[in-house]
């Protein structure tokens, strides 16, 4: 199973922690960057760089931040109400199918394909056929000669929950 | 299918420590509160208290501070229990339950393990 | 603590027939939030309670229709609308409107 949960997987969200500021449900639920309390008469504001949520709720405990892992850069800082943004290093990509590690980009398209997208934190450069213009699938064939190219540069953060 | 299985029973003596444990399956274990109640015979329900897989925060019943203890293996989706010092008075059945992470829905159980037999006599 | 007690703590029942049973709190269920956290489990012999009825009148997924709760405040009911041979067994009220969450004695049903 995944060791991750995401306001989105929780829907809303919170946890208690001593001589945080407190103030009282509206409707049974708490504002983003806090959590309601054990007996439902409270919320308690998450703990910065700690822990956060992002929308009314009333879970009993907030979502611990992200820690971007070795490989991705920190684009911003966990905050009360926004989980950690963490990006893949310039050179690598995060598939969608595997969002736990980047990988790194191709440097190059296979033998009679050309390069029409660069590298992004979030897609490996795309090629396609010469003539064709049909995308290739993605893995390098063995022994095939490639055309280098350099990683692009982001053009947007990729935003990863946690 | 959620499933909670429990481990077996126990006879212990005055005194002594057990631990039970609670191997749930069938759901995403760190999603759900592991609730643990106590079945004295012939008697009603106490809830214990529970515990947070996401975090590993617990929230006691007052009565239970310092009487249970509850931990979990995430790697094994198992939750445990540990009651210290025992007496006779521990003797019941001890019953881990899920509920849900929000307070709206997290006072009520929709799953419980069979039940494990704790008796204490010398 | 709150205190939940429960009548009659025994009901001898006839199939078909409808059953009743009462559930009281020492104090009022109905929090800040305007819900009301009472609920009803079933503990047939030799099992581990089940969940019925969750929030006064919510039948948890799978229960017979035969079973309803109703009540507000301190005065709680569980209805059974024709009593089946499966349905015996201790039923017993709960709150979670007030930590620390506490039971009702429980109401034994039983087979004239």
């Known amino acids: 199973e995944s060791a991750l949960i995401t306001q989105q997987d929780l829907a809303p969200q919170q946890r208690a922690a001593p001589q945080q500021k407190r103030s009282s449900p509206s409707e049974g639920l708490c504002p983003p960057g806090h959590h309601i309390s054990e007996d439902g008469r409270d919320c308690i504001s998450c703990k910065y760089g700690q822990d956060y949520s992002t929308h009314w709720n009333d879970l009993l405990f907030c979502l611990r931040c992200t820690r971007c892992d070795s490989g991705e850069v920190e684009l911003s800082p966990c905050t009360t109400t926004r989980n950690t943004v963490c990006q893949c290093e310039e050179g690598t990509f995060r598939e969608e199918d595997s969002p736990e590690m980047c990988r790194k980009c191709r440097t190059g398209c296979p033998r009679g394909m050309v390069k029409v997208g660069d590298c992004t934190p979030w897609s490996d450069i795309e090629c396609v056929h010469k003539e064709s213009g049909t995308k290739h699938s993605g893995e390098v064939p063995a022994v095939e000669e490639t055309v280098t190219s350099s990683p692009g540069t982001p053009a947007s953060p990729c935003s990863l929950s946690g | 299918e959620v499933q909670l299985v429990q481990s077996g029973a126990e006879v212990k003596k005055p005194g002594a420590s057990v631990k039970v444990s609670c191997k749930a399956s069938g759901y995403s274990f760190i999603g759900y509160f592991m609730n643990w109640m106590k079945q004295s015979p012939g008697m009603s329900l106490e809830w214990i208290g529970r515990?947070?897989?996401?975090?590993?925060?617990?929230f006691y019943n007052q009565k239970f501070k310092g009487k249970a203890t509850l931990t979990v293996d995430k790697s094994t989706s198992t939750a445990y229990m540990e009651l210290s010092s025992l007496r006779s008075e521990d003797t019941a059945v001890y019953f881990c339950a899920r509920s849900a992470y929000y307070f709206d829905s997290g006072g009520y159980f929709d799953y419980w393990g069979q039940g494990t037999l704790v008796t204490v006599s010398s | 603590d709150i205190v939940m007690t429960q009548s009659p703590l025994s009901l001898p029942v006839t199939p078909g027939e409808p059953a009743s049973i009462s559930c009281r709190s020492s104090?009022?269920?109905?929090?800040?939030?305007?819900?009301?956290?009472l609920h009803w489990y079933l503990q047939k012999p030799g099992q581990s309670p089940q969940l019925l009825i969750y929030?006064?009148?919510n039948r948890f997924s799978g229960v017979p229709d035969r079973f309803s709760g109703s009540g507000s405040g301190t005065d709680f009911t569980l209805k059974i609308s024709r009593v089946e041979a499966e349905d015996v067994g201790v039923y017993y009220c709960s709150q979670s409107t007030h930590v620390p969450w506490t039971f009702g004695p429980g109401t034994k049903v039983e087979i004239k």
């Open positions: 104090q009022s269920l109905v929090h800040s939030n305007k819900n009301t956290y």
């Open positions: 515990f947070n897989p996401y975090n590993e925060d617990t």
């Open positions: 929030k006064v009148s």
